[in-house]
Amino acid sequence: QVQVVTQDEREQLYTPASLKCSLQNAQEALIVTWQKKKAVSPENMVTFSENHGVVIQPAYKDKINITQLGLQNSTITFWNITLEDEGCYMCLFNTFGFGKISGTACLTVYVQPIVSLHYKFSEDHLNITCSATARPAPMVFWKVPRSGIENSTVTLSHPNGTTSVTSILHIKDPKNQVGKEVICQVLHLGTVTDFKQTVNKG
């Protein structure tokens, strides 16, 4: 049966993003419509047809355009994605003979981790803090020279859609740690990044 091939995309906040649909059919469509899926009913964004060309709805005028003007292959591009653009989008190919054939492509917005790593001595212990803020929520791990060191983790969600994960490493005998390297590992979207800190006695 006739189908539409799509691919989900994950792009960085405030960068361009493109979503593509391909009608697997011998014949082109008469008109292509892109809609954003919403809880109640889909919202029309843009249409393309031979009759009327590209027609962008006012709410999307400065946000998107159709960058592949096809009636079999259609691509929309967001110039500068925001968190509001995250979601799923439907492309509808209105075909002669077989009506509306649709596909769905989803856009996920990510924010690269911003990491801070610092330490603080108290009289009898050492606290090393690693904080990572990203979207989706990052994970924070420690690599330390010896085992048995406790840590505590706090997660905080921000209104802008990012999440901060703060992990504090509690070292009871700080003298043994002086001159040694501690590594904070941040896992985000399948990639682990090491942040190294050597403890010096201040």
């Epitope: 006739v2 011998a26 014949q27 008469l30 009759n51 002669f96 003979g97 077989f98 009506g99």
Partner: antibody
């Protein structure tokens, strides 16, 4: 040159089935939809259904309540329209045509199907 | 189903006349309308598609217009070979439906 050649006239009894063929030549068969329309004596044209030979997907006018089946044989570049449970009001000339999207350009010569007891 | 109503049902005209045939849909068909010419014992011949686009090889005296529910076929100057029956077809919604036809006869 492009041609759609239909099978010959048929006389059928009520309750029987008829299968009309439409042989395409002069173009790539899978690039165009094949459609079927009919015209009873003194009546308007009536769209029966169509097939996309590329996939074999078809769409039928529900008026025919499952009596119509449109198929194709890509190796023979031929489309078929079968109408079952024939009744006298199915007496008509049956035409196949081809379309690229909504651009209709070639038609078969028509096949007269007479349903009579 | 969408109903297509053509008017007039028949029309007498002379060679050289300007003739207009109209087709009214029971709902908006988004300009998805074709016009066909049919002569007795012959297959229909496509003249216009998508309301106003002329099919290749069709003389420029034929033109189509309209939008929404109301559509028109105009023959600017009738020729002897134009006397035939004309049908409109909507293909906005399945099942696709034809008008009842307009028979154009020589006066």
């Amino acid at each position: 040159q492009v041609q759609l050649v239909q099978s010959g006239a048929e006389v059928k009894k009520p309750g029987a089935s008829v299968k009309v063929s439409c042989k395409a030549s002069g173009y790539s068969f899978t690039d165009y939809i094949i459609l079927w329309v009919r015209q009873a004596p003194g009546q308007r044209l009536e769209w029966m259904g169509h097939i996309d030979p590329y996939y074999g997907s078809s769409n039928y006018n529900l008026k025919f309540k499952g009596r119509v089946t449109i198929t194709r044989d890509t190796s023979a570049s031929t489309a078929y329209m079968e109408l079952s449970s024939l009744r006298s009001e199915d007496t008509a000339v049956y035409y196949c045509g081809r379309s690229k999207r909504d651009y209709f350009d070639y038609w078969g010569q028509g096949t007269l199907v007479t349903v009579s007891s | 189903d969408i109903q297509m109503t053509q008017s007039p049902s028949s029309l007498s005209a002379s060679v050289g006349d300007r003739v207009t045939i109209t087709c009214k849909a029971s709902q908006d068909i988004n300009s998805y309308l074709s016009w066909f010419q049919q002569k007795p014992g012959k297959a229909p011949k496509s003249l216009i598609y998508r309301a106003n686009r002329l099919v290749d090889g069709v003389p420029s005296r034929f033109s189509g217009s309209g939008s929404g529910t109301d559509y028109t076929l105009t023959i600017s100057s009738l020729q002897p070979e134009d006397f035939a029956t004309y049908y409109c077809l909507q293909y906005d919604e399945f099942p696709y439906t034809f008008g009842q036809g307009t028979k154009l006869e020589i006066k």
